[in-house]
Amino acid sequence: TQHGIRLPLRSGLGGAPLGLRLPRETDEEPEEPGRRGSFVEMVDNLRGKSGQGYYVEMTVGSPPQTLNILVDTGSSNFAVGAAPHPFLHRYYQRQLSSTYRDLRKGVYVPYTQGKWEGELGTDLVSIPHGPNVTVRANIAAITESDKFFINGSNWEGILGLAYAEIARPDDSLEPFFDSLVKQTHVPNLFSLQLCGAGFPLNQSEVLASVGGSMIIGGIDHSLYTGSLWYTPIRREWYYEVIIVRVEINGQDLKMDCKEYNYDKSIVDSGTTNLRLPKKVFEAAVKSIKAASSTEKFPDGFWLGEQLVCWQAGTTPWNIFPVISLYLMGEVTNQSFRITILPQQYLRPVEDVATSQDDCYKFAISQSSTGTVMGAVIMEGFYVVFDRARKRIGFAVSACHVHDEFRTAAVEGPFVTLDMEDCGYNIPQTDESTLMTGRA
């Protein structure tokens, strides 16, 4: 997932549930037992800090060693710090685990900026605020890294929740979630509610607050409002989806929809920003600038570099447009749209100005590897990764940050023709090049 623009990890302090819930859809297919309902023990099990990732507590080894692990739907390795590092408070000590097994194999994962490398093994793993199970899983013990761990982020490893095809060193290394489903009765599904605070949090506030929920094996009704809308997983590697239309304040960008998915579109909790292909980014920024033209902002702001500050409490949310992404629906010629607010794509940044100011970074950026629906998107929604049915569901998050005039939305159906043509077919190349361009 994207280092250098690692995600917002903030708590749900700023977003209250949106009042009365709409009645549940009545035409849903029956679910297998345990897939829906209340998962009290897993609610609020994520924490984190703006721009630095959402993490869950996990235990590894016997006796159990507790670590905070970044939840990353954009990669497929379970990898943990296993040697001292200036940015780590603690690390996995294999020699102290009686259940550790060495696979006698190394792994090297380069990113565009930074890398990690380590030694592969297996050990017993559990999630204290997750299902009451223990599984033997593959673990990459990180022995060396560069620009991977983040100072002050409070996580010591990464949980790659995507598919085996993008696992390193190759697709024979079973990802954690596959092991979990194989070894237990946990249904092949998880859901994420990432809660942006809407304002920066200092370290102590982060540690004392909630960053969201990872519901393993099910869907929790209390975490969303309205209906869940599903889009097909196009291919099981990343969580790849197809975007069929993009609107800024209701104005269609009017691009060939293939451009929106060039060379892919993925849902990635390990990336901070909404990242868009170059042409799409340029068109989107032009449209956002036009919509907010009563005020002008420096060029560096639109590059995600300079911060714009307003006196505390006076951020002019109303001048910034909403952004709608239309996703392919489950039914032929049917799509639905997810709409985010500036409260999602303007990311509050802590520790830069005085308490008199609210300062923000523009959290939409340019990509050379396709669209990445990072935390900027996910913080607006409850996102269901329904691996069993090869689909991803979106509903309005009960914790998303909004104002009295606008809220994030998930709406449909819309009639959209020839949606299959929106997918880009990546030419077959050496798979070892797949993950190296993710900065």
């Epitope: 420096p298 060029d299 560096g300 300079q306 911060l307 500050c309």
Partner: antibody, heavy 120, light 108 residues
């Protein structure tokens, strides 16, 4: 070429309101490429940013002065103005108007400045 | 608040010498930093923007470098007209609000 010229009284009494105008000549204040700003410099001291304005009327102020500052624009006269209320001797300074260019980030053109003394 | 600290406060040099002025930010400002020159009785003039880009009409003897928290303005060979006060300014936080305290370059 574009020039900026500050004008206004050089002496203001304590508790009164300081009023200055900056006239833009040789170009249009309505250019979408610039903000316009005020900066001041107390005698023998450093520079202090006061605030900016865009031709649309959108303003940004220094938080430490915000409660006393108003910046306005008159596109028909190609001018923008500064009002600073409830002045004290600490507001005695050379007041500069300037253009914020280079992607709205840097003061790339300045007026010559006008000294305003606050004294009874 | 980002604080810019300039050093030295005063630099005493002779014409033809090399001048090296420092500006340190209390936290990273990326490359969003400018240098201004102010001569007595005159308005400041933009010399360098984005840490290293010379503004229009600025002689090549002026150069800027640095990023993050440490920045340097170098005048490769001082001319008589270069004796002045130099200010740095960060615009990482916008609108631009913070200037350094200044460095006076005087004739030795």
């Amino acid at each position: 070429q574009l020039q900026l010229q500050e004008s206004g009284p050089g002496l203001v009494k304590p508790s009164e309101t300081l009023s200055l105008t900056c006239t833009v000549s040789g170009g249009s204040i309505s250019s979408s490429s610039y903000y316009w700003g005020w900066i001041r410099q107390p005698p023998g001291k450093g520079l202090e940013w006061i605030g900016n304005i865009y031709y649309s009327g959108s303003t940004y102020y220094n938080p430490s002065l915000k409660s006393r500052v108003t910046i306005s624009v008159d596109t028909s006269k190609n001018q923008f103005s500064l009002k600073l209320s409830s002045v004290t001797a600490a507001d005695t300074a050379v007041y500069y108007c300037a253009r914020l260019g280079h992607g709205y980030s840097y003061f790339d053109l300045w007026g010559r400045g006008t000294l305003v003394t606050v004294s009874s | 608040e980002i604080v810019l600290t300039q050093s030295p406060a005063t630099l005493s040099l002779s014409p033809g010498e090399r001048a090296t002025l420092s500006c340190r930010a209390s936290q990273s400002v990326s490359s969003y930093l400018a240098w201004y020159q102010q001569k007595p009785g005159q308005a400041p003039r933009l010399l360098i923007y984005d840490a290293s880009n010379r503004a229009t009409g600025i002689p090549a003897r002026f150069s800027g470098s640095g990023s993050g928290t440490d920045f340097t303005l170098t005048i490769s060979s001082l001319e008589p007209e270069d004796f002045a006060v130099y200010y740095c300014q960060q615009v990482y936080l916008w609108p631009p609000r913070t200037f350094g305290g200044g460095t006076k370059v005087e004739i030795k």
